[in-house]
């Protein structure tokens, strides 16, 4: 038994960020005369939260009217709670002293824990595009959550990934925490439409996890396959050679026709057709005037895709002594080669 006891009935209080925290405190006596003060933390570095005697504390309101006679309820409310408000709060009775007030009795303290939602996960992929069969890393970050316990999962097109590493910082006590995770993903040619999803579950989200996504379309590069073919004669002395550029992504592509190594024409892919898997096809043709050539012609379709080194495919066009007799089999020998 004591002359005066300061009672803080709640050992801990859990409040969501943005809400109001109620910290309860009652005294068993009003004697001796002196103010109640609230502090966060203990010892010389403690932070004054409220002083009944004096001061301006805009975020703090008293639960009851402290100017009312015989009031022994010194509970306070703190508005707009943030993770930075977490800590142990002490209700302390002071007694009038000469010249200064003297700490008389302290409550046992109430630990305020702040539940703060994690920020929306941000997923980022590699700086440079990569081709199928390569492994790329994706990172996911979310910040500002409390308490520390959190669950992070990775998915690719709804399938959970297992090859990832996750860290929650800091390791020790903090007002709020951050999570950082790196997942490894093996690219396939079908990944243009694929999504990588980072899913974060936290107590503050009430079973409705937050998701961050990255489209593999921003990461993948599917190099084209080339096929050069000779079409039937359109008119006498003319041969139509086509270059089929298939299954490439992204669309950025430049094609150059070479006749015996000399640039004949350069064009940029424009009216492409899109495949179901999100890759593109494009076709370019070259009309060759056979009569203009005395010797065989080596036609090369050279493609520069997405800033990568050019790939090419060649087609040999045989020129005979009697062009007028040339039919649709002018290039009876069609030797193709991939040159890089």
């Amino acid at each position: 038994e004591e002359e005066l006891q300061v009672i803080q009935p709640d050992k801990s209080v859990l409040v969501a960020a943005g809400e109001t925290a109620t910290l309860r405190c009652t005294a068993t006596s009003l004697i001796p005369v002196g103010p109640i003060q609230w502090f966060r933390g203990a010892g010389p570095g403690r932070e004054l939260i409220y002083n009944q005697k004096e001061g301006h504390f805009p975020r703090v309101t008293t639960v009851s009217d402290l100017t009312k006679r015989n009031n022994m309820d010194f509970s306070i409310r703190i508005g707009n709670i943030t993770p930075a408000d977490a800590g142990t709060y002490y209700c302390v009775k002071f007694r009038k002293g000469s010249p200064d007030d003297v700490e008389f009795k302290s409550g046992a303290g109430t630990e305020l824990s702040v539940r703060a939602k994690p920020s929306a996960p941000v997923v980022s992929g590699p700086a440079a595009r990569a081709t199928p069969q390569h492994t790329v890393s994706f990172t996911c970050e979310s910040h500002g959550f409390s308490p520390r316990d959190i669950t992070l999962k990775w998915f690719k097109n709804g399938n959970e990934l297992s090859d990832f590493q996750t860290n929650v910082d800091p390791v020790g006590e903090s007002v709020s925490y951050s999570i950082h995770s790196t997942a490894k993903v093996v690219l396939t040619r079908e990944d243009v439409h694929s999504q990588v999803i980072c899913e974060v579950a936290h107590v503050t989200l009430q079973g409705d996890p937050l998701r961050g996504t990255a489209n593999l379309s921003e990461t993948i590069r599917v190099p084209p396959t080339l096929e050069v073919t000779q079409q039937p004669v359109r008119a006498e002395n003319q041969v139509n050679v086509t270059c089929q550029v298939r299954k490439f992504y992204p669309q950025r592509l430049q094609l150059t026709w070479l006749e015996n190594g000399n640039v004949s024409r350069t064009e940029t892919a424009s009216t492409v057709t899109e495949n179901k898997d999100g890759t593109y096809n494009w076709m370019s043709w070259l009309l060759v005037n056979v009569s203009a050539h005395r010797d065989d012609v080596k036609l090369t379709c050279q493609v520069e895709h997405d800033g990568q080194p050019a790939v090419s495919k060649s087609h040999d066009l045989k020129v005979s002594a009697h062009p007028k007799e040339q039919g649709s089999n002018t290039a009876a020998e069609n030797t193709g080669s991939n040159e890089r």
Partner: antibody
Framework: QVQLQESGPGLVKPSQTLSLTCTVS????????VNWIRQPPGKGLEWIGI???????DYNSALKSRVTISVDTSKNQVFLKLSSVTAADTAVYYC????????WGQGTTVTVSS | DIVLTQSPASLAVSPGQRATITCRAS??????????MHWYQQKPGQPPKLLIY???NLESGVPARFSGSGSRTDFTLTINPVEANDAANYYC?????????FGGGTKVEIK
Amino acid sequence: QVQLQESGPGLVKPSQTLSLTCTVSGFSLTGYGVNWIRQPPGKGLEWIGIIWGDGSTDYNSALKSRVTISVDTSKNQVFLKLSSVTAADTAVYYCARAGKMDYWGQGTTVTVSS
Amino acid sequence: DIVLTQSPASLAVSPGQRATITCRASESVDSYGNSFMHWYQQKPGQPPKLLIYLASNLESGVPARFSGSGSRTDFTLTINPVEANDAANYYCQQNNEYPWTFGGGTKVEIK
């Protein structure tokens, strides 16, 4: 139950130091303060000072230079020392519990005389 | 120092009547919404006994015939109805400011 009992010499010579003891029971001296109050014959009450549960003290400024209040919590005793006494210090001396003064001892009479 | 002036100095009351004692402080004894004024009864050869604390609160075990009121500088102790064993000296006391002080006392006699 709560009890306080003052004890000490009934007669003190002028200029000497008056020493009194208040022995308490039924409460803890670490939880409650103890006051000393005196009452000259046929007169009113005068507060001398208090020792709080943490051992800190507050004294009547009129007597401060001559008064010392101390405590021995292990013996449940509070002590009053009043130095350089004169006949004006003749009084019944009481100890009383806490700021509320809800329990008093019976008092002990101290006469200052040569 | 806060000086407490009690009036009257003495008072004779018949049993069953009302006795009113006033205590005026030289400055306010109010702090933090409360009046740190208390009332004691002292009978001859006995220590004072707490009757009322914080101006108006009846101490445990004290008959409800005793009541206190007032704030800041003006306080009243009322005994209604007075009984024969209420004959005693009555003191007001403040512990709002050091040094704590007592009033000079009011002697209540029963007619």
